[in-house]
């Protein structure tokens, strides 16, 4: 058993049918010595008397808020949560496996630049009685500071019969140098509590590996005289690290017909312009990627050919 | 990714082309190592990230772009120098700060070159003959060092009398390649910045 926060405790259980569970001793936080009784949650049934209460915690019916009283007055509370270990592996019931970029990916994180700011998000089908708390650091043995805000519900979508809820959090490394070469990964830890179930999820990454630039901005077309060709031009996104000559991007320009089946013409360039043939009803899209370290491509910025 | 490769303009900063080749070569070598050594811990998540140049060179700090000198987090405890304008020790007079940056890059290359050559000698003794260093990568390191045109003492190749542990050598190869790729990215950024200056 360990303390998650004041008066909230997590009991770790080897979870299998007929498991013996864990013996837990609760102590009433009071100078009083006698006339103390214990109850669980809203029930008025007295579970025991005395300054300490010994219980055998086996399943969720044994978890909850234990309260010690004296003469109708509440003295203190202890909330017991359960953390299930199933065949040597901690349970992952609360969050959905996003399966991207690989199986067992519960937390996904992205950064728009090298400033040390990043966003993480996760998915759940649970709508109520759910709380999250997020901590982060650079490295784990001698951790350096990363400050995270509160997790917020950022999106809701319907998937088949189920509603899916997306939560996200923004974090900022306390002292980040955009040019630094990372040798210790960022660690992100999310505590999730649903009713009386506790779970924790972690992710470990280098900022360089989670970079996803914003799409190029000010995408414009300039027709070339006496030609079907157009000059496409764009600019670096505002959120990208500066100076751009040091943090350079490379670009992919795509001409896509109205039908998804039509052949796509693609050109790669390090410049912020390109000459392409603009077909009728086609659209031109441009996306960006770090020129020197192949992390994710940005989303596409698009303009119609007409 | 397979991108069309642009050939540099003749007047281009001489080292940019070499540094781009270096990054391409080390990335290819790392990819090959990850595929060949699939049963070894060779991915970024599995290896320890060690920097053999730590406390010996200060490339990141010495080559910091002027715009980042206002960022206190970039100003380490070490004495930091900042690159200004100049070329790859070409015809124009190179500033002192610039020389510090480029000599730091040269020292990095020299250290990695020695490590890779020592390692290759060990890998050639492996009866499994599973993996060797790409000669192209070693050649590209050499070309960039020549373009940087610094004269420094030759570091003797380390020779080891004990029987090599091939498992450990292959894991060390992965660690070195990961670290060298990160340094090659920094070198490329620096060269690109200098080219634009």
């Amino acid at each position: 058993i360990w303390e998650l926060k004041k008066d909230v405790y997590v009991v770790e259980l080897d979870w299998y049918p007929d498991a013996p569970g864990e013996m837990v001793v609760l102590t009433c936080d009071t100078p009083e010595e006698d006339g103390i009784t214990w109850t669980l949650d809203q029930s008025s049934e007295v579970l025991g008397s005395g300054k300490t209460l010994t219980i055998q915690v086996k399943e969720f019916g044994d978890a909850g808020q234990y309260t010690c009283h004296k003469g109708g007055e509440v003295l203190s509370h202890s909330l017991l949560l359960l953390h299930k270990k199933e065949d040597g592996i901690w349970s992952t019931d609360i969050l959905k496996d996003q399966k991207e970029p690989k199986n067992k990916t519960f937390l996904r994180c992205e950064a728009k630049n090298y400033s040390g700011r990043f966003t993480c998000w996760w998915l759940t089908t649970i709508s109520t009685d759910l709380t999250f708390s997020v901590k982060s650091s650079r490295g784990s043995s001698d951790p350096q500071g990363v400050t995270c805000g509160a997790a917020t519900l950022s999106a809701e979508r319907v998937r088949g019969d189920n509603k899916e809820y997306e939560y996200s959090v923004e974090c900022q490394e306390d002292s980040a140098c955009p040019a630094a070469e990372e040798s210790l990964p960022i660690e992100v830890m999310v505590d999730a509590v649903h009713k009386l179930k506790y779970e924790n999820y972690t992710s470990s990454f280098f900022i360089r590996d989670i970079i996803k630039p914003d799409p190029p901005k000010n995408l414009q077309l300039k027709p070339l005289k006496n030609s079907r060709q157009v000059e496409v031009s764009w600019e670096y996104p505002d959120t990208w690290s500066t100076p751009h000559s040091y943090f350079s991007l490379t670009f992919c320009v795509q001409v896509q017909g109205k039908s998804k089946r039509e052949k796509k013409d693609r050109v790669f360039t390090d410049k912020t312009s390109a000459t392409v043939i603009c077909r009728k009803n086609a659209s031109i899209s441009v996306r960006a990627q770090d020129r020197y370290y192949s992390s994710s491509w940005s989303e596409w910025a698009s303009v119609p050919c007409s | 990714r397979n991108l069309p490769v642009a050939t540099p303009d003749p007047g281009m900063f001489p080292c940019l082309h070499h540094s781009q080749n270096l990054l391409r070569a080390v990335s290819n070598m790392l990819q090959k190592a990850r595929q060949t050594l699939e049963f070894y811990p060779c991915t970024s998540e599995e290896i320890d990230h060690e920097d053999i140049t730590k406390d010996k060179t200060s490339t990141v700090e010495a080559c910091l772009p002027l715009e980042l000198t206002k960022n206190e987090s970039c100003l380490n405890s070490r004495e930091t120098s900042f690159i200004t304008n100049g070329s790859c020790l070409a015809s124009r007079k190179t500033s002192f700060m610039m020389a510090l940056c480029l000599s730091s890059i040269y020292e990095d290359l020299k250290m990695y070159q020695v490590e890779f050559k020592t390692m290759n000698a060990k890998l050639l003794m492996d009866p499994k003959r599973q993996i060797f260093l790409d000669q192209n990568m070693l050649a590209v390191i050499d070309e960039l060092m020549q373009a940087l045109n610094f004269n420094s003492e030759t570091v003797p190749q380390k020779s080891s009398l004990e029987e090599p542990d091939f498992y450990k050598t292959k894991i060390k190869l992965c660690i070195l390649l990961h670290a060298f790729r990160i340094r090659a990215v920094t070198i490329d950024r620096v060269m690109s910045y200098l080219n634009a200056s």
């Epitope: 049918p17 399943e59 270990k85 199933e86 065949d87 592996i89 199986n103 | -």
Partner: antibody, heavy 115, light 112 residues
Framework: QVQLVQSGGGVVQPGRSLRLSCAAS????????MHWVRQAPGKGLEWVAF????????YYADSVKGRFTISRDNSKNTLYLQMKSLRAEDTAVYYC????????WGQGTMVTVSS | SYVLTQPPSVSGTPGQRVTISCSGG????????VKWYQQLPGTAPKLLIY???QRPSGVPDRFSGSKSGTSASLAITGVQAEDEADYYC????????????FGTGTKVTVLG
């Protein structure tokens, strides 16, 4: 004590369907994940499928994906395996099993796919 | 499609020490716990070892398990006639959990 009693096995022609059941008692069935494991005659153990305690997630071996469906009825304390488009290579003893460091197995039920 | 490899058979005379190996990889045994099962003819498998080296109550102490790196092993110290059975190791793969990965199985024969 924990008990898993299986039923539903038998002889079936290729291409036909069969549903296996596993009735649980002696524990809070709705709190635990469950597996199906099979063993072809004279062969080793092969995992078939898994279902979460609340039925929210299901996982299948590639060899049965799209043909077999694992399900549970927590009000009846019963686990099911619906098998469709059966093939000769599905001939095996099928076991249900609890998920956990200490596990309990059903007695097994024989499924023979033969024309 | 078995990822955990066991020797097909091992044998020993009563009282001898018999060991069965189970070889896997970094993503399965290297990252997860190992179990061992005993299966007597015509019966369901019976758990012998869980958590690499833990014995459930009721399992004789002549059975012991261990794990090192990407391999695990089961030892029967002082093998007895009633130990003649098939033995299977089981683990998970970190990418496909909760799918069970079983070993190829080992037939233990007690001679004499």
């Amino acid at each position: 004590q924990v008990q898993l009693v299986q039923s539903g096995g038998g002889v079936v022609q290729p291409g036909r369907s069969l549903r296996l059941s596993c009735a649980a008692s002696g524990f809070t069935f709705s709190s635990y994940g469950m597996h199906w494991v099979r063993q072809a005659p004279g062969k080793g153990l092969e995992w078939v499928a898994f279902i979460r305690y609340d039925g929210s997630n299901k996982y299948y071996a590639d060899s049965v994906k799209g043909r077999f469906t694992i399900s549970r009825d927590n009000s009846k304390n019963t686990l099911y395996l619906q098998m469709k488009s059966l093939r000769a290579e599905d001939t095996a003893v099928y076991y249900c099993k609890t998920h956990g460091s200490h596990d309990n197995w059903g007695q097994g039920t024989m499924v023979t796919v033969s024309s | 499609s078995y990822v955990l490899t066991q020797p097909p058979s091992v044998s020993g005379t009563p009282g001898q020490r018999v060991t069965i190996s189970c070889s896997g990889g970094r993503s399965n045994i290297g990252s997860n716990k190992v179990k061992w099962y005993q299966q007597l003819p015509g019966t369901a498998p019976k758990l012998l070892i869980y958590g690499n080296d833990q014995r459930p109550s009721g399992v004789p102490d002549r059975f012991s398990g261990s794990k090192s790196g990407t391999s695990a092993s089961l030892a029967i110290t002082g093998v007895q006639a009633e130990d003649e059975a098939d033995y299977y190791c089981q683990s998970y793969d970190r990418g496909t959990h909760p799918a069970l990965l079983f070993g190829t199985g080992t037939k233990v024969t007690v001679l004499g």
